[in-house]
């Protein structure tokens, strides 16, 4: 891996800078493709913040980026105003930069914010130049708030500083009034004021009346050094700004303003319910705006305009629907500050609230929701149901749109159609089983988030209270006996306080379920069983007659059991009992009680008489330990052999 | 707050078709869970007759259900009762309810 | 169908007593139970729904608890306008059903 660009970054204060290839440019001698160029950030800026300029401005500091990314212009740096004044500030980045299967290799992005450079966004060099706004005939004050190059100062070490001051040289003097210091007039012979008296409040304007025309001066600002000597340092040449209003004049009032609401990537206009004021002195197109900071997700735009954005506009251009925003790919809300003005009033700040709607969102389901059998019902998740778009939607609302059919959706325990995502989260939402005659059942919903809505089913599954044996192969062509240690529902039982029943809605596909005789006195064979109970299993009543596989020679292979288990005031739940089999084995020992051995296995030890064991089984009965599993085939022998 | 008012006659000859309708007033028929209808027979206690959802779907008191069908017009934010083949049994205060706030009953009268 | 057992049927109290009325259902209900007042001529309202919890509006003097099969209304401290018939109901199982009602009287 190897690393180019300049490693440095220059930034305007209090702007947002995106990092570019002349910047950062990572390569490999391998040509990776630039998506698997990993910077990580070890240490992030102290100055600022980086962040991905499609992903969450005011959320967590960004951890990784790509090159990919860098070269998209989507990785973002935005110096953070302090409130100390500054000429120059150092920020630095520690990254590093991966891409598996070479070594990492470590970067230090230098970061300088500065108010040498030329920057489009602030036009002034000073800490503030803001202009000043007085009555017309009147006097107004040039205080700090409006004029301040203390940043300049900033230039000069700390200890030094107290001797050091700026001087303003006025090269070009206000047409229609005067600048005064404590009271005396500026003028060609007397041209100069210093930082110190404009922060002692000795800076006065005077307007000379005769109408509200603008007025300004122009300046040289630079440092001076002890007993007014000229030093080396910082100097800029700007003008500053009067404006002159009418005494008569009603300042604009600001409308509430509704949040432009858009999908990424697309354009919409920007109405008065936006952007208004109230002003009967004033026509639309006299109502100025002026962006004074802009979001990430967007810029503003005129019809018949260039196709970048602008910063100024008029009310008239919002009335006439010429004004428009134009959303890139960020998902992310932003807020436009505005400055609004009449051209006779002091500039009100106003700001256009910019919400990107999702331009579709998915109900993800990654679950059906389980509900235990003995209880009933089961609070939803995250797993069932959560909004996502463009980014998770924590603030989604559902409503139902077809209930369940076999149960209601509870919200603090009382039927409810509606809720949100943080109560889902929350566990508050229960879907309850009202009806026990279903496994199972679902329900529709509709998810809101952001104006924008989907649905989605969401499926309910019982899950049975029920013990599955899982044990080892059983044997082909044998009859084992079915009872609690293969499918065991004492614990549903109990729960209940009833006798569950079992209901075969489903194979095996090699073999069947028999009601064995209890003795020689009953009367017939084995019985086919599509339905027993708890009481049955637990009475050693039933068989399981494993049948080999047609059609090929004896061989293992798996076989399933799907049964529906149903008790008073639960619903019924599906349960299966899946098992393997196998030819049978005289040498194995099976851990499940034999009622028979498959007949060539019998012919083989002398016994042709007897296919099907009709007596009691003997001691396998009530032997803690299945007969077969004391020594194979003689064990069998020796239990069977007086049946 | 979710308001129900009933309304239909207060007397049915025996072997024909009860018919109340509850008008809903602060709440919409298609948000509240459960409309059910109640009744209550004199000085006796209370019995659930059935209920229609706020997606329409229906669930009645077995004990009733082949006499009884509730419907809706969403239009109009009512349901309704239709309870057929009445007898002297079926004389009660009817009262429609979502259990969280209940109309204030009408007394039916089944005599010829 | 689930069966709602009230007790007592009635009972006499005074104002400023503390009164508990029990509700038993025939098989499990966990916490799926409403209380409700009624008094003559007016329709029943709501007091307590989900055992516990207080519907919006009603004193605090009414509480629920239970889970289960065995229930409780309790009126911490006897009011003149709380003499009426309290009945319970369940809402776990469908169809839903009420008990017969508690009357509580004037000593």
């Known amino acids: 891996l190897s690393l180019e660009g300049s490693r440095t970054l220059t930034v305007c204060p209090g702007s947002v800078q995106p990092l570019s290839s002349q910047t950062l440019r990572a390569s490999s001698s391998a040509g990776t493709d630039p998506q698997l160029l990993l910077y990580r950030v070890v240490r992030g800026p102290q100055l600022g913040r980086l962040f991905h300029a499609q992903q969450d401005s005011t959320g967590e500091a960004l951890v990784n980026f790509t090159q990919a990314e860098v070269y998209a212009g989507n990785i973002l740096y935005e110096h953070e105003m302090p409130t100390e004044p500054f000429w120059e500030a150092h920020d630095t980045l520690e990254l590093q930069l991966s891409s598996p299967p070479a070594r990492d290799v470590a970067a230090t992005l230098a970061v300088a914010v500065s108010f040498e450079a030329a920057c489009p966004q602030r036009p002034s060099h000073l800490w503030k130049n803001k202009g000043l706004w007085v009555p017309e005939g009147q006097r107004a004050k040039i205080t700090m708030a409006a004029l301040d190059a203390s940043n300049l100062l900033a230039s000069v070490p700390s200890p030094q500083r107290l001797e050091h001051d700026v001087l303003f040289q006025v090269t070009q003097f206000p047409s229609r009034g005067q600048l005064l210091v404590s009271e005396e007039p500026l003028h060609a012979g007397q041209p100069h004021f210093l930082q110190s008296q404009l922060a002692a409040g000795q800076l006065v304007y005077a307007h000379g009346g005769g109408g509200t025309q603008q007025d300004g001066f122009h300046f040289r600002a630079h440092l001076q050094g002890p007993a007014g000597a000229t030093v080396a340092g910082p100097q800029t040449s700007e003008a500053f700004a009067i404006t002159v209003r009418d005494v008569n004049e009603r300042p604009p009032q600001p409308q509430a303003s509704v949040p432009l609401r858009i999908t990424r990537g697309s354009r919409a206009p920007i109405s008065r319910a936006q952007l208004s004021v109230v002003d009967p002195d004033s026509a639309p197109g006299e109502i100025e705006y002026e962006v004074q900071r802009a979001p990430h997700n967007g810029f503003l735009s005129l019809v018949g305009g260039g196709p970048g954005p602008v910063t100024h506009f008029t009310q008239a251009d919002v009335d006439s629907g010429r004004l428009a925003f134009v959303a890139n790919g960020s998902s992310v809300a932003g807020v436009f500050q505005l400055s609004m003005s009449d051209g006779a009033s002091p500039p009100l700040p106003m700001s256009l609230a910019v919400d990107i709607l999702p331009s579709a969102i998915e109900v993800q389901l990654q679950a059906p929701l389980e509900v235990p059998q003995a209880l009933g019902r089961s609070s939803l998740s995250q797993q069932q149901l959560r909004v996502v778009s463009d980014r998770e939607e924590p603030e989604a609302a559902y409503r139902l749109i077809q209930g369940p059919k076999y149960g209601h959706l509870l919200v603090g325990g009382r039927p409810a159609s509606a809720f949100s995502q943080l109560q889902i989260d929350q566990g508050e939402v229960v879907f309850a089983f009202t009806n026990f005659s279903s496994s199972h059942d679902h329900f529709r919903v509709l998810a809101l988030a952001r104006g924008v809505n989907a649905s989605a089913v969401v499926n309910i599954t019982v899950r049975a209270l029920l013990h599955v044996w899982a044990g080892g192969p059983w044997p082909q062509g044998a009859t084992l006996r079915l009872d609690p240690t293969i499918l065991d529902a004492g614990e549903l039982a109990n729960r209940t306080g009833s006798v569950p029943h079992f209901r075969l809605l489903e194979g095996p596909r090699h073999g069947r379920v028999v009601r064995v005789p209890r003795a020689r006195t009953e009367p017939g064979g084995s019985q086919l069983v599509e339905q027993f109970t708890q009481q049955d299993l637990e009475d050693g009543r039933l068989g399981l007659e494993v049948g080999r596989p047609e059609g090929r020679a004896p061989s293992p292979t798996g076989d399933s059991l799907t049964l529906e288990l149903w008790a008073q005031g639960v619903p019924p739940a599906v349960a299966s009992l899946d098992f393997a089999t196998e030819p049978y084995n005289a040498a194995r020992p099976y851990s499940v009680a034999l009622l028979s051995v498959p007949e060539a296995t019998r012919m083989e030890a002398g016994k042709p008489e007897s296919s099907t064991p009709t007596g009691e089984p003997g001691p396998m009965a009530s032997s803690p330990v299945p007969a077969v599993a004391k020594g194979g085939f003689l064990g069998f022998l020796e239990a069977n052999m007086f049946s | 707050q979710v308001q129900l008012q009933e309304s239909g006659p207060g007397l049915v000859k025996p072997s024909q078709t009860l018919s109340l309708t509850c008008t809903v007033s602060?709440?919409?028929?298609?948000?509240?869970?459960?409309w059910n209808w109640i009744r209550q027979h004199p000085g006796k206690g209370l019995e659930w007759i059935g209920y229609?959802?706020?997606?329409?779907?229906?669930n009645y008191n077995p004990s009733l259900k082949s006499r009884v069908t509730i419907s809706r017009d969403t239009s109009k934010n009512q349901f309704s009762l239709k309870l057929s083949s009445v007898t002297a049994a079926d004389t009660a205060v009817y009262y429609c309810?979502?259990?969280?706030?209940w109309g204030q009953g009408t007394l039916v009268t089944v005599s010829s | 169908d689930i069966q709602m057992t009230q007790s007592p049927s009635s009972l006499s109290a005074s104002v400023g007593d503390r009164v508990t009325i029990t509700c038993r259902a025939s098989r499990g209900i966990r916490e799926y139970l409403n209380w409700y007042q009624q008094k003559p001529g007016k329709a029943p309202k709501l007091l307590i729904y989900?055992?516990?919890s207080l519907h919006s509006g009603v004193p605090s003097r009414f509480s629920g608890s239970g889970s289960g099969t065995d229930f409780t209304l309790t009126i911490s401290s006897l009011q003149p306008e709380d003499f009426a018939t309290y009945y319970c109901?369940?809402?776990?199982?469908?169809?839903?059903?009420f008990g017969q009602g508690t009357k509580v009287e004037i000593k």
């Open positions: 989900y055992t516990g």
């Open positions: 109901q369940q809402y776990s199982e469908l169809p839903w059903t």
């Open positions: 602060g709440g919409s028929i298609t948000s509240g869970y459960y």
């Open positions: 229609i959802t706020f997606d329409g779907s229906n």
């Open positions: 309810a979502d259990f969280d706030y």
